[in-house]
C-alpha cells in the first residue's frame, strides 16, 4: 500500500489506502473514482512571481522504500516543460509563470517505475492542475468611444445608451471579473447604473439650444468596485437631439415691398423670414396670409431650402385702381409637440405693406384675338372688319395700327392706321387658302416702344367659281355581243368649291351627241351617272371606238358646268363577258372614230 506524508498534504484526504497517492495543493471535493485509481484536482495560482519554482504536489507509492529503486515520471500537458518531477522524491513543480487566461486546466498522468526492471509498480494515475485565477485583467469596454443621442428636455431617467465592459478574468471565482460602472465625467447631466452600464439623463430641462454636446467618461472597475480593483474607461459622446420647444419669431413687425403693376401672377416681390431656434423639421415654417386687403391679390409660399416666406403676385395688379396693399402674414410650425404647447402658440405674425408702382403699359386690344370673314369674290379694298386698342395708362396716349408683314408676306391685307379697319389689297381665292392668319400691331404714337400685338384669323367664304370635273379619266369597253341597256361605266365628278348645302351634280350627253347616240347617260341623282348601251351588239370592225361628250353641271349659283369625254372601245369578249381583244384600227384609221353617232 501507499501512504503520503501528511505534512505534504494540504487537502486532508480521508485516511484510505491508495495504490498511488498525490498530495499538495489539492482539493478533494471534486475527487471521483476513475477505474480503480484516484483522480485529483490541484490548484495553482496563476502569474506566480516567486523566485523558486512553484510547488504543485508530491507523488508517492507505498512501494517506495526510500532506497532509490523507484523512479517517478510525469506525462501529459506541459510535462517536462511547464511541470517537472523529481524522479526520486516524486515532488512536482511548475517551472514557469502560468496564465489562467491562456490555459485554465492541465491534465497530467503520473507513474511509479521500478528502475531495475523498467516496469510500473503501480497503474498510471491521471490528475488535473487547475490554474487559480488572480485579478490580472482590467475591464475593457467593447468600444473605445460610444456615440449616443437623447432628445432635449427629456424626463430625468431617460435611457441614453448602454456601455459594456468585459473582463478576461474568471467570472465564476471571486470578484475578479465582477464589473461595476461609475461616472467620472458628465455629472450632473447624466448618471450610470452601476451594474448594467445603462446611462440615463440626470438633469431636468436639458436644452439643446443652450448646449448640444456632452462628453461623458465612464469607468468600469472589477472586484465589484472595491479598493484594489482594476479599471478601464470609455468616452461617451452624447448629442441632444432637437424637439420643437421654440416657436418661430419674426425679427421685425413690419415689412415693406414694392412691385410694378406689370408683375404677372407668380412674380416674387419679397422675402420674409421668421427665425426658429430649433433645427430640422422642428424649424420648418409654414407662412400664410391671414388678413388684409391684399388677401386675394397676393400669395405667400415657403421656400423649403431657406425657410423664407416668398410673397408673390396672385392676380394682375393695376396702379390706376389701387396703389397700396396691407397684408398680415403668419409664420407657424407644422410639426408641433403637444407637451410644449403650454409655452404659448407656435406661430407669429407680421404686417407686410406692398406698394404698387405705375408702369407705362402698352396698348390693350379689345379682344385677345379677332375672327373675321370675307367672300372669296370680294373686290380689292373691301373692308373686312376692324380692331380696337387703347392705352390703359392714365395718359390715354393715341394709338396707330399696322399689319405685321412677316405674317402677310403677299400683302393681301391692309389696315387703316388710324381707325383699325382691315381691308383687302389683293383678290382672294378660297380654293388656294381658306384661312389667313395675320398679326396686327398697335403702337403708342408718343412712345413707339410701347406696342401690342393681336392675332387676326380671317376666313375666306366660298363662292361657286369652279365647274365640276370628272373624278378621273374614263376609258371603258363594250362587248360586241352586248345587250341594250347594259351598264358599262359609272361616272363620278369632283368640284373644288365647298357649297353650304353640299355638292349636287347633274350629268347629260352633250347636245351635239344626244340624238342618235349608241349610248345613253343615266343620272343616278347621287352625284354619279351610268353609261348604258343603247342597242344590241356592236361591230368593232365597223366602229372600234366611240367618244362620248358628257356635260357635268353643279346646282349652286351661278351654275358652273364642264364637258368631259368618255372613250368607249368595242371588244371581242368570251361568253362570260371578259374582254379578249380590242383591235386598235380606230387609233390608226380616223374613219373608225365616232363621237357616238
Amino acid at each position: 500500500t501507499l501512504s503520503t506524508p501528511l505534512s505534504k498534504r494540504t487537502s486532508g484526504f480521508p485516511a484510505k489506502k491508495r495504490a498511488l497517492e498525490l498530495s499538495g495543493n489539492s482539493k478533494n471535493e471534486l475527487s471521483r473514482s476513475k477505474r480503480s485509481w484516484m483522480w485529483n484536482q490541484f490548484f495553482l495560482l496563476e502569474e506566480y512571481t516567486g523566485s523558486d519554482y512553484q510547488y504543485v504536489g508530491k507523488l508517492h507509492s507505498d512501494q517506495d522504500r526510500g532506497d532509490g529503486s523507484l523512479k517517478y515520471i510525469l506525462s501529459g500537458d506541459g510535462a517536462g516543460d511547464l511541470f517537472i518531477i523529481n524522479e526520486n522524491t516524486g515532488d512536482i513543480q511548475a517551472t514557469k509563470r502560468l496564465d489562467r487566461e491562456e490555459k485554465p486546466v492541465y491534465i497530467l498522468r503520473a507513474q511509479a517505475i521500478n528502475r531495475r526492471t523498467g516496469r510500473p509498480v503501480e497503474p498510471e494515475s491521471e490528475f488535473i492542475i487547475k490554474i487559480h485565477d488572480i485579478n490580472d485583467n482590467e475591464p475593457i469596454f467593447t468600444k473605445e468611444v460610444y456615440t449616443a443621442t437623447v432628445p432635449e428636455m427629456s424626463d430625468v431617467g431617460t435611457f441614453v445608451v448602454q456601455v459594456t465592459a468585459t473582463d478576461a478574468d474568471d467570472p465564476t471565482y471571486g470578484n475578479s471579473a465582477k464589473v461595476v460602472y461609475s461616472i467620472l465625467q458628465g455629472q450632473p447631466y447624466f448618471s450610470v447604473e452601476s451594474e448594467t452600464g445603462i446611462i440615463k439623463t440626470a438633469l431636468l430641462n436639458m436644452d439643446r439650444e443652450n448646449r448640444e454636446q456632452y462628453q461623458v467618461v465612464i469607468q468600469a472597475k472589477d472586484m465589484g468596485g472595491q479598493m484594489g480593483g482594476l479599471s478601464g474607461t470609455t468616452t461617451v459622446n452624447i448629442t441632444l437631439t432637437d424637439v420643437n420647444d421654440n416657436p418661430p419669431r419674426f425679427p421685425q413687425s413690419t415689412y415693406q415691398f414694392k412691385t410694378p403693376e406689370s408683375s404677372p401672377p407668380g412674380t416674387p416681390i419679397g422675402r420674409i423670414k421668421a427665425s426658429d431656434a430649433d433645427v430640422g423639421e422642428n424649424a420648418e415654417i409654414e407662412y400664410s396670409i391671414t388678413d388684409g386687403e391684399g388677401l386675394d391679390m397676393f400669395d405667400v409660399i415657403t421656400d423649403q431650402e431657406t425657410q423664407e416666406g416668398i410673397i408673390t403676385v396672385k392676380k394682375l395688379l393695376d396702379f390706376e385702381k389701387k396703389k397700396v396693399y396691407t397684408l398680415k402674414v403668419e409664420a407657424s410650425n407644422p410639426h408641433v409637440e403637444p407637451r410644449f404647447l403650454y409655452l404659448g402658440p407656435f406661430k407669429d405674425s407680421a404686417t407686410v405693406r406692398i406698394v404698387v408702382e405705375d408702369v407705362d403699359e402698352p396698348p390693350v386690344f379689345s379682344k385677345l384675338a379677332y375672327i373675321l370673314q370675307i367672300r372669296e369674290d370680294a373686290q380689292i379694298n373691301t373692308t373686312i372688319g376692324s380692331v380696337t386698342a387703347q392705352d390703359p395708362d392714365a395718359a390715354r396716349n393715341p394709338v396707330k395700327y399696322s399689319v405685321d408683314r412677316h405674317t402677310d408676306m403677299d400683302r393681301i391685307f391692309n389696315i387703316d392706321s388710324g381707325n383699325g379697319s382691315i381691308f383687302t389689297s389683293k383678290l382672294l381665292d378660297r380654293e388656294t387658302l381658306l384661312w389667313h392668319n395675320i398679326t396686327v400691331i398697335a403702337t403708342e404714337i408718343n412712345n413707339p416702344k410701347q406696342s401690342s400685338r393681336v392675332p387676326l384669323y380671317i376666313k375666306v367664304l366660298d363662292v361657286n367659281d369652279n365647274a365640276p370635273e370628272f373624278a378621273e379619266f374614263y376609258e371603258t369597253f363594250v362587248c360586241e355581243k352586248a345587250k341594250a341597256d347594259q351598264l358599262i361605266q359609272t361616272l363620278r365628278a369632283v368640284d373644288k368649291d365647298d357649297p353650304y348645302s353640299g355638292h349636287q351634280f347633274s350629268f347629260s350627253l352633250a347636245p351635239e351627241a344626244a340624238s342618235g347616240s349608241n349610248f345613253t347617260i343615266q343620272d343616278n341623282k347621287d352625284n354619279t351617272a351610268g353609261i348604258l348601251t343603247r342597242k344590241n351588239g356592236y361591230n368593232r370592225h365597223e366602229m372600234s371606238t366611240y367618244l362620248l361628250p358628257v356635260v357635268i353641271s353643279d346646282n349652286d349659283y351661278p351654275v358652273q358646268s364642264s364637258t368631259g369625254t368618255v372613250t368607249v372601245r368595242v371588244c371581242a369578249c368570251d361568253h362570260h363577258g371578259n374582254m379578249q381583244s380590242c383591235h386598235a384600227e380606230a387609233l390608226i384609221h380616223p374613219t373608225g372614230l365616232s363621237t357616238g353617232a
Epitope: 487566461e101 491562456e102 490555459k103 485554465p104 486546466v105 488535473i128 487547475k130 490580472d136 485583467n137 482590467e138 475593457i140 469596454f141 467593447t142 468600444k143 473605445e144 468585459t166 478576461a168 474568471d170 467570472p171 465564476t172 471579473a177 482594476l230
Partner: antibody
Framework: QVQLQQSGAELVRPGTSVKMSCKAA????????IGWVKQRPGHGLEWIGD????????NYNEKFEGKATLTADTSSSTAYMQLSSLTSEDSAIYYC???????????WGQGTTLTVSS | DIVMSQSPSSLAVSAGEKVTMSCKSS????????????LAWYQQKPGQSPKLLIY???TRESGVPDRFTGSGSGTDFTLTISSVQAEDLAVYYC????????FGGGTKLEIK
C-alpha cells in the same frame, strides 16, 4: 482529445426560429468560453458571441443582438444557440468553438449548416 | 468597433517559398497591463473547420509546425510561413480579441 459535436443540418422557413446545439467532451465544460461563428458560403468568418457556461456570462456582437441567444446546460456539457426571425441572410454554416477570452478558439465543432428557404 | 483588414486577399506561391501576409487593426490591440497583443491567426482548409495557429500575436499553439510565425504589435501584424508546403493551401484569418472579437476578411493561399 477535446471534442465539440454539433447538431445536424437544418432547413427552415423564413420568419421561424432554430436552436442548434454543441456538445462538449473530454474537458471541463465550465472552465472555457464557448464561442459561435457564422460563415456564409464563399465568405469569411463572423463572430456572433461567447458564453461562459460556468456562470452564464455572455458577450454578443452588436449585429447579432436580438437575433442570437446563447445558453448552456452544464449537466450535459452542451451549449445552444437560438436564431430567431430567420431570413435568407441567415443561411450559413455556424461553428461553435472552445477558447479563452484573450487568446483564441483552440478547438472547433464540425459546423451546422442552416438553410432558410420558402 | 475594431475593424480588421487583411492583405493580400489572395496569393499563389510555389512549395518551399516563404510567404507573408498582413493584418491591420483600426486601433491598437496592445494591452499595456498584460504586455500582450490580443491577436490570433487561424487556418481554414477547404471543407474544414478553422484551426488556431497563433495567439497573443506570436505564441504558437501546441502542435502547430514551427514554419508558422506570428509577429507585430499595436495595429500591424504579420503571419509568415517560412517554407510553404502543399498542405498549407487554405484561407488564413486574423482575429482581434481586445474589444470582444472581430475577424479579418481572410487571405487565400494557393499553391502554384
Amino acid at each position: 482529445q477535446v471534442q465539440l459535436q454539433q447538431s445536424g443540418a437544418e432547413l427552415v422557413r423564413p420568419g421561424t426560429s432554430v436552436k442548434m446545439s454543441c456538445k462538449a467532451a473530454e474537458y471541463t465544460f465550465t472552465n472555457y468560453w464557448i464561442g459561435w461563428v457564422k460563415q456564409r458560403p464563399g465568405h469569411g468568418l463572423e463572430w456572433i458571441g461567447d458564453l461562459y457556461p460556468g456562470g452564464d456570462h455572455a458577450n454578443y456582437n452588436e449585429k447579432f443582438e436580438g437575433k442570437a441567444t446563447l445558453t448552456a446546460d452544464t449537466s450535459s456539457s452542451t451549449a445552444y444557440m437560438q436564431l430567431s426571425s430567420l431570413t435568407s441572410e441567415d443561411s450559413a454554416i455556424y461553428y461553435c468553438a472552445r477558447g479563452m477570452l484573450t487568446t483564441g478558439f483552440d478547438s472547433w465543432g464540425q459546423g451546422t449548416t442552416l438553410t432558410v428557404s420558402s | 468597433d475594431i475593424v480588421m483588414s487583411q492583405s493580400p486577399s489572395s496569393l499563389a506561391v510555389s512549395a518551399g517559398e516563404k510567404v507573408t501576409m498582413s493584418c491591420k487593426s483600426s486601433q491598437s490591440l496592445f494591452n499595456s497591463r498584460t504586455r500582450k497583443n490580443y491577436l490570433a491567426w487561424y487556418q481554414q482548409k477547404p471543407g474544414q473547420s478553422p484551426k488556431l495557429l497563433i495567439y497573443w500575436a506570436s505564441t504558437r499553439e501546441s502542435g502547430v509546425p514551427d514554419r508558422f510565425t506570428g509577429s507585430g504589435s499595436g495595429t500591424d501584424f504579420t503571419l509568415t510561413i517560412s517554407s510553404v508546403q502543399a498542405e498549407d493551401l487554405a484561407v488564413y484569418y486574423c482575429k482581434q480579441s481586445y474589444y470582444l472579437r472581430t475577424f479579418g476578411g481572410g487571405t487565400k493561399l494557393e499553391i502554384k
